[in-house]
C-alpha cells in the first residue's frame, strides 16, 4: 500500500511539476522591468524566452517574437534548450510512469518490469527537474550580471549626468514558477525511485517451496511470517525478502474484480 501511495504521489507531483515547467517555458515574464529606485514610467517592459512585451499604462500591450535565431545570446539559447529537454524528458517520463503505475494493469506485466519502468521514469523526472532548475538558474544569473552592469552604467557618463534612463530587468514570475516546478519534478522523480525499490523483488538465497494441496495452493515461506493464498494452481516460486513484516505491495497480488486491465 505504501509503495502504491509513494508511486502515485510521485506521479502526481511530477505531473504538476512538468505542467509548471511547460507553463514557465511559455510565460512571457522571465524578466520584468525593475521599478525600484527608477523613475516611474508609464510603460512596463517584460521579456520571455520567445518574445518581449511592452505594457503601456493605457492598457495596450504589444509583444514581439524573437524572429532571429543566430542573433540571440548564446545563454538564452542554452536556457531554451534546457527547458525543452526538461519538457521532453518529463513528457516521456510521464508516459512511461503511467504504464508503471501499480494500480494500472497491462496484460500480464511482471512487477519487475513495472519496477524498471518506475525507475526509468523516476530518473527521467529527476533529470527533467534538474534541467528546469539549471535553465532558470542560468537565466537568473544572466539577469543579475546584466542588472549590476546596467546599474554601473547608470552612474557613468558625461559629468555623471544621466543622459538616458537604462531599463534594468529583474526576476520575473516565470523564474519562480520554474524553480518550484523543477523542484516538484525532482521530488516526484525521487519518490518514483523510492517506489521502485518497493516494487522490485530482491534476490535471496531462499526460494519458496510450494506444497500443492487439493483445491488451492499455499506457499510456505521459510521465516514463517506470512502465507499467501492464490486462486487456482500457482507453481511459480516467489522471491522472498529477508524476514520482517511486509505490506500488501510487497506480496505478489492476484487479479480480482477490483483490478483494472
Amino acid at each position: 500500500m505504501a509503495v502504491t501511495a509513494c508511486q502515485g504521489l510521485g506521479f502526481v507531483v511530477s505531473l504538476i511539476g512538468i505542467a509548471g515547467i511547460i507553463a514557465a517555458t511559455c510565460m512571457d515574464q522571465w524578466s520584468t522591468q525593475d521599478l525600484y529606485n527608477n523613475p516611474v514610467t508609464a510603460v512596463f517592459n517584460y521579456q520571455g524566452l520567445w518574445r518581449s512585451c511592452v505594457r503601456e499604462s493605457s492598457g495596450f500591450t504589444e509583444c514581439r517574437g524573437y524572429f532571429t535565431l543566430l542573433g540571440l545570446p548564446a545563454m538564452l539559447q542554452a536556457v531554451r534548450a534546457l527547458m525543452i529537454v526538461g519538457i521532453v524528458l518529463g513528457a516521456i517520463g510521464l508516459l512511461v510512469s503511467i504504464f508503471a503505475l501499480k494500480c494500472i494493469r497491462i496484460g500480464s506485466m511482471e512487477d519487475s518490469a513495472k519496477a524498471n519502468m518506475t525507475l526509468t521514469s523516476g530518473i527521467m523526472f529527476i533529470v527533467s527537474g534538474l534541467c528546469a532548475i539549471a535553465g532558470v538558474s542560468v537565466f537568473a544569473n544572466m539577469l543579475v550580471t546584466n542588472f549590476w552592469m546596467s546599474t554601473a552604467n547608470m552612474y557613468t557618463g558625461m559629468g555623471g549626468m544621466v543622459q538616458t534612463v537604462q531599463t534594468r530587468y529583474t526576476f520575473g514570475a516565470a523564474l519562480f514558477v520554474g524553480w518550484v516546478a523543477g523542484g516538484l519534478t525532482l521530488i516526484g522523480g525521487v519518490m518514483m525511485c523510492i517506489a521502485c525499490r518497493g516494487l522490485a523483488p530482491e534476490e535471496t538465497n531462499y526460494k519458496a517451496v510450494s506444497y500443492h494441496a487439493s483445491g488451492h495452493s499455499v506457499a510456505y515461506k521459510p521465516g514463517g511470517f506470512k502465507a499467501s493464498t492464490g486462486f487456482g494452481s500457482n507453481t511459480k516460486n516467489k522471491k522472498i525478502y529477508d524476514g520482517g513484516a511486509r505490506t500488501e505491495d510487497e506480496v505478489q497480488s492476484y487479479p480480482s474484480k477490483h483490478d483494472y486491465v
Epitope: N45, S57, S58, G59, F60, V162, V165, Q166
Partner: antibody, heavy 118, light 113 residues
C-alpha cells in the same frame, strides 16, 4: 462615436470644493483610463492624473496630489474629479481625456471652466 | 519631472509653406523594449480641446491629414507640416508619455502672415 461629456461651468468661493464630472460614451467605460488636464487661461496644459475606471487605481501628478481626488462610478459610467481648498490659482478649464495606445489622449471632453471668485 | 522645451514659441507662415517645429525632452523618451518613442503631438484651436495628431513620435492618428509628419528619436523631435493650410493655424503641443508625471511643452503658435 467616442464622446466625453463634461459637467457645466462652475463659479465657486475660495476655500470650498468643486466636483467636475465626465461621462464617456461610445466605448466600454472600464476599458480605458481617464486622465484629467488643467489649462489656465492663455496658458499651457498640465496633467493632473489618471484613473482606471475598471479597478479604481489612480496615478497623480505630485503637484496635484493634495488638490485633486479622482474617482470613477461604474454604475453611472462617470469619472469625477474633486478639487478641494480652492484658490484663484485653481481657476482654469479642466479637461477629461481618454488614454489610448502610446499613452496618448485621443478623445477629449469639451472642458469645464472653474472660476474661483470671492 | 521631465521638461519639454518647444521652439519656436510662435511661427508666422504663409499658406502652402512647409513648416517645422521642434520639441526637446530633458530625458530620452525611447523605450528599449519596443524601440518606440513615447512622444505625442496635439493641435489646439481657440475654445476647443486639444486634438491628437501624432503618437509614438511618428504614428499619425487616423483621420489626420498626411501633410502632418512626426519624426525624431530619444530627446529631439520634430513636427512637420508639408503645406500649411488656413485650418492648421493653431497651437501645437508636444507631450511626454513615457515618464510620470506626463508633461506637456509650452506650445508653438502657428499664425498666418
Amino acid at each position: 462615436q467616442v464622446q466625453l461629456q463634461q459637467s457645466g461651468r462652475e463659479v465657486v468661493r475660495p476655500g470650498t470644493s468643486v466636483k467636475v464630472s465626465c461621462k464617456p460614451s461610445g466605448y466600454a467605460f472600464t476599458n480605458y483610463l481617464i486622465d484629467w488636464v488643467k489649462q489656465r487661461p492663455g496658458q499651457g496644459l498640465e496633467w493632473i492624473g489618471g484613473i482606471n475606471p475598471g479597478s479604481g487605481d489612480t496615478v497623480y501628478n505630485e503637484k496635484f496630489k493634495a488638490k485633486a481626488t479622482l474617482t470613477a462610478d461604474k454604475s453611472s459610467m462617470t469619472a469625477n474629479m474633486q478639487l478641494s481648498s480652492l484658490t484663484s490659482d485653481d481657476s482654469a478649464v479642466y479637461f477629461c481625456a481618454r488614454r489610448v495606445r502610446g499613452n496618448s489622449f485621443d478623445s477629449w471632453g469639451q472642458g469645464t471652466l472653474v472660476t474661483v471668485s470671492a | 519631472d521631465i521638461v519639454m522645451s518647444q521652439s519656436p514659441s510662435s511661427l508666422t507662415v504663409t499658406a502652402g509653406e512647409k513648416v517645422t517645429m521642434s520639441c526637446k525632452s530633458s530625458q530620452s523618451l525611447l523605450n528599449s523594449g519596443n524601440q518606440k518613442n513615447y512622444l505625442t503631438w496635439y493641435q489646439q484651436k481657440p475654445g476647443q480641446p486639444p486634438k491628437l495628431l501624432i503618437y509614438w513620435a511618428s504614428t499619425r492618428e487616423s483621420g489626420v491629414p498626411d501633410r502632418f509628419t512626426g519624426s525624431g528619436s530619444g530627446k529631439d523631435f520634430t513636427l512637420t507640416i508639408s503645406s500649411v493650410q488656413a485650418e492648421d493655424l493653431a497651437l501645437y503641443y508636444c507631450q511626454n508619455n513615457y515618464f510620470y508625471p506626463l508633461t506637456f511643452g509650452a506650445g508653438t503658435k502657428l499664425e498666418l502672415k
